[in-house]
């Protein structure tokens, strides 16, 4: 079996302030089992944007139904974008662990740029 890859096909996305950003991410395998998380930025100071396993993320919706069998689409939409949302977003696959899931593989990142609303 080929090792899972996390594909973020868009290097960059430009969204107008107040609109919804779609950040695309797919995995190439169902193995290993474990959730997807999205982060803004990299390294220890990265900001959690969405966690499939747990948490409340009112601005974020998933594009696909994550409970459906064979789903490998982990794209998200972030609503009501503001300039403060600009940055590079990473889709990260975790593998099931005990007691905690373990980071397995990250996508290459998608840079979100925000175009100001015309005044």
């Amino acid at each position: 079996e080929e090792e899972l890859q996390v594909i973020q096909p868009d290097k960059s996305v430009l969204v107008a302030a107040g609109e919804t950003a779609t950040l695309r991410c797919t995995a190439t395998s169902l193995i290993p089992v474990g959730p997807i998380q999205w982060f803004r930025g990299a390294g220890p100071g990265r900001e959690l944007i969405y966690n499939q396993k747990e948490g409340h993320f009112p601005r974020v919706t998933t594009v696909s139904d994550l409970t459906k069998r064979n789903n490998m689409d982990f794209s998200i939409r972030i609503g009501n974008i503001t300039p403060a949302d600009a940055g590079t977003y990473y889709c990260v696959k975790f593998r099931k662990g005990s007691p905690d899931d373990v980071e397995f593989k990250s996508g290459a990142g998608t840079e979100l740029s925000v175009r100001a609303k015309p005044s």
């Epitope: 079996e1 169902l30 193995i31 089992v33 474990g34 966690n51 499939q52 396993k53 747990e54 948490g55 139904d65 994550l66 409970t67 459906k68 069998r69 064979n70 789903n71 099931k96």
Partner: antibody, heavy 119, light 110 residues
């Protein structure tokens, strides 16, 4: 830490109904399927049904389709399995189990609820 | 419905020896490039525990003496060097269609 806490043991008379609960914690309840499995004393495992708490989609073992009903309460992260028209051969331990990979498998299990059917 | 038949129903193996449990499906459980077979271990008084998923992938925390193999209709769970704590009943499960379990194999120490 994923936890599934089931309701206590029940004793029922033939012809009665039983409703077993399974309270989930440590994860987003609506993102993962819940399965129900039973095990008669000294016997093997028998799959009953499964439910997607996000939209209440259900799949039933044909053997139980007319007697079992699965429901969820997303406000309390609780799944329920009701079994009607109980017979003595329904005496079993009833387990709930969470499917962490949408593979129609059972990654995390409750401790089980013993249902005894006796006149 | 897919029927899973495990063999043997029970077996006794010496400590440190290899234990092999087979699971045969009444039709292929392969689909979308995966073999939809899972293995569980159940010790007395406990719920089952997932060992192997999609035929050959060890679950988190499962010792590497456990391995799964096979494709299509024939699958095997192997314990390379039996330990005392491996005494249990082992079940295969398929999910190519809706889930069904094999009847179980009781593993004891010789």
């Amino acid at each position: 830490q994923v936890q599934l806490v089931q309701s206590g043991a029940e004793v029922k008379k033939p012809g009665a109904s039983v409703k077993v609960s399974c309270k989930a914690s440590g994860y987003t309840f609506t993102n993962y399927w819940i399965n129900w499995v039973r095990q008669a004393p000294g016997q093997g495992l028998e799959w009953i049904a499964m439910i997607d708490p996000s939209d209440s989609e259900t799949h039933y073992n044909q053997i139980f389709k007319d007697r079992a009903t699965l429901t969820t309460d997303t406000s309390t992260s609780t799944a329920y399995m009701e079994l009607r028209s109980l017979r003595s051969d329904d005496t079993a331990v009833y387990y709930c189990a969470m499917d962490y990979g949408s593979l129609y498998a059972m990654d995390y299990w409750g401790r089980g609820t013993l249902v005894t059917v006796s006149s | 419905d897919i029927v899973l038949t495990q063999s043997p129903d029970s077996l006794a193996v010496s400590l440190g020896e290899r234990a092999t449990i087979n699971c045969r499906a009444s039709k292929s459980v392969s689909s979308s490039g995966y073999n939809w077979i899972f293995w569980y271990q159940q010790k007395p008084g406990q719920p089952p525990k997932l060992l192997i998923y999609l035929a050959s992938n060890r679950d988190s925390g499962v010792p590497d003496r456990f391995s799964g193999s096979g494709s299509g209709t024939d699958f095997t769970l192997t314990i390379s060097s039996l330990q005392a704590e491996d005494v249990a009943v082992y079940y295969c499960q398929e999910s190519r269609e809706l889930p069904t379990f094999g009847q179980g194999t009781k593993l004891e120490i010789k």
